[in-house]
Interface confidence: low
């Protein structure tokens, strides 16, 4: 059976297409190509006579067509108007005609698209933004990309107008993009330049850093305030409710206890008209807000009961602290044999008795913090009693 095949089926505008013929019969007079799905002399493109090997152009010939002896038809520099059906009529020697119809589709080479927006400076949680991919073209698929990824499923994202328009409902600061639109057809694809949104937002609740609350007298107090905001926030500082300065950073050298108090950072966004504050408590004190873990040492950890004495020492680098001792969860000293010395840093047990065996630890503390050492184990042994007569039992 006579058939035709388009190579390629989808053709880019300006390119060429070859209408191939398969199963061409023997003993032919000639053949003729027509535009359309039927034989119509008014739409004849070209006729070819085998005997004379002569091609005769028809009414529908544009000068871009070439017919080959094998009946294939080459059309060059195709336009979108060339899209459609083409019919080949073969005139056999027995004057019986055969026909075959094929088709192809011409698509334009797509231009680089661009994105238009109805609002490039939206306000967070308030405005919606509609992006439109230009130009509008037929037989084109519109795709959208956010941050180089295809659109996520989200109730805030809506596509309309044949996917040519992307609407962001109630934009957030995370919707800055970049946004790209891509147009596709079977023969080409092109992507726009990225577009970003300048989302106005904030300020958020400011953060004051560093997070330290406690400072030693004589230190420099350097506080920095930051609030997420677009455009960037304007900052001001208040100390105990009194305005100090309009800067993002506050520096007070050589602080004293009088600098203790509440430090307020005020952040303002002149575009959104919003402002937020954060208050940080600063406490200037000689006391260490975090007492380091003390170390506990024993003059010996295995002693002989009723004979040996032992000294336990609690070591710390912190100043302005107190020390207390514990044994089996009981506060020490608990007997006259236990003595504390050197500001409670040393616990002496003299003499050691069986009931002194067990776990000891010390704790260092000041009015705002405390820490305790790892436990230390004291073992108490008793020597075996000597035989009265010095002889082994018989």
């Amino acid at each position: 059976q006579l058939t035709t095949e388009s190579m390629p089926f989808n053709v880019a505008e300006g390119k060429e297409v070859l209408l191939l013929v398969h199963n061409l019969p023997q003993q032919l007079f000639g053949y003729s190509w027509y535009k359309g799905e039927r034989v119509d002399g008014n739409r004849q493109i070209v006729g070819y006579a085998i005997g004379t090997q002569q091609a005769t152009p028809g009414p529908a010939n544009s000068g871009r067509e070439t017919i080959y002896p094998n009946a294939s038809l080459l059309i060059q520099n195709v336009t979108q108007n060339d899209t459609g059906f083409y019919t080949l009529q073969v005139i056999k020697s027995d004057l019986v005609n055969e026909e075959a119809t094929g088709q192809f589709h011409v698509y334009p080479e797509l231009p680089k698209p661009s994105i238009s927006s109805n609002n490039s400076n939206p306000v967070e949680d308030k405005d919606a933004v509609a992006f439109t991919c230009e130009p509008e073209t037929q037989d084109t698929t519109y795709l959208w990309w956010i941050n180089n990824q295809s659109l996520p499923v989200s109730p805030r994202l809506q596509l309309s107008n044949g996917n040519r328009t992307l609407t962001l409902l109630s934009v957030t600061r995370n919707d800055t993009g970049p946004y790209e639109c891509e147009i596709q057809n079977p023969v080409s694809a092109n992507r726009s330049d990225p577009v970003t949104l300048n989302v106005t937002y904030g300020p958020d609740t400011p953060t004051i850093s560093p997070s330290d609350t406690y400072y030693r007298p004589g230190a420099n107090l350097s506080l920095s305030c930051y609030a997420a905001s677009n455009p960037p926030a304007q900052y001001s500082w208040l100390i105990n409710g009194t305005f100090q300065q309009s800067t993002q950073e506050l520096f007070i050298p050589n602080i004293t206890v009088n600098n203790s108090g509440s430090y307020t950072c005020h952040a303002n966004n002149s575009v959104t008209g919003c402002n937020r504050t954060t208050v940080k408590t600063i406490i200037v004190t000689e006391l260490s807000p975090v007492v380091a873990k003390p170390q506990i040492k024993a003059s010996k950890t295995t002693v002989t009961g009723d004979k040996d004495s032992v000294n336990l020492t609690c070591s710390t680098n912190d100043t302005g602290i107190s020390i207390r001792w514990f044994f089996k969860n009981q506060s020490l000293p608990s007997s006259e044999r236990m003595k504390l010395s050197q500001g409670n840093t040393t616990l002496s047990i003299n003499p050691v008795k069986r009931e002194d065996a067990g776990t000891y630890w010390c704790e260092v503390f000041n009015p705002i913090s405390k820490n305790q050492s790892d436990p230390i184990m004291l073992n108490v042994n008793y020597n075996a009693l000597p035989q009265e007569n010095g002889l082994s039992p018989g």
Epitope: T205, T278, K280, T281
Partner: antibody, heavy 121, light 106 residues
């Protein structure tokens, strides 16, 4: 200026229930922890309940635990106190209070004017 | 729970005098807070974080203390200072209040 307006107080019999409301305005309600504090006639202040800013966490003293429930609707800027199995000793002025700063919320920085709850037969 | 004991229960002084109100805890607390309450009114925050005056509180008021002993001092009493003052802690749960000190005109 921060505004806290309590409502819902009244006379109720022992064993009865009452729901107090506190309408908040002039501040970002969802940023702040909120509490109820009560004061029996001629007596001192007693903490009743606290709820975190997002409403996830709640705290009660033993005296009301299991009987009172604090809740909030951040979309309506409203704090609630559901009081069940009321006793005579629950008679008091109930104050709605907003906590202090975000970084140190352990005090009651703003108070409403209170709503009086009387439990009596 | 931490119990706060305020003393004296009533303090009778004249305007211009110095007032010292005490709040003692049965266990060490990190900070103390003070509230002022006048008859028929809600409490008002007065001192926070032991020594910081709340908004609108005059400079004649000062707070101090540490550990278990805290003090609210009024350097020179004005007529509007006569009220009940409560201390409050929240170092550990539950938060507790003192029973109050009534400052009255002598």
């Amino acid at each position: 200026e921060v505004q806290l307006l309590e409502s819902g107080g009244g006379l109720v019999q022992p064993g009865g229930s009452l729901r107090l409301s506190c309408a908040a305005s002039e501040f970002t309600f969802s940023d702040h922890a909120m509490s109820w504090v009560r004061q029996a006639p001629g007596k001192g202040l007693e903490w009743v309940a606290t709820i975190s800013s997002g409403g996830t966490y709640t705290y009660y003293p033993d005296s009301v635990k299991g009987r009172f429930t604090i809740s909030r609707d951040n979309s309506k800027n409203t704090l609630y106190l559901q009081m069940n199995s009321l006793k005579a000793e629950d008679t008091a002025m109930y104050y709605c209070a907003r906590h202090g700063f975000d970084y140190f919320p352990y005090w009651f920085a703003h108070w409403g004017q209170g709503t009086l709850v009387t439990v009596s037969s | 729970e931490i119990v706060l004991t305020q003393s004296p229960a009533t303090l009778s002084l004249s305007p211009g005098e110095r007032a010292t109100l005490s709040c003692r805890a049965n266990s060490a607390v990190s900070y103390m807070y003070w509230y002022q309450q006048k008859p028929g009114q809600a409490p008002r925050p007065w001192i926070y974080l032991t020594s910081n005056r709340a908004t609108g509180v005059p400079a004649r008021f000062s707070g101090s203390g540490s550990g278990t002993d805290y003090t609210l001092t009024i350097s020179s009493l004005e007529p509007e200072d006569f009220a009940v003052y409560y201390c409050q802690q929240w170092t550990s749960n539950p938060p507790t209040f003192g029973q109050g000190t009534k400052l009255e005109i002598k």
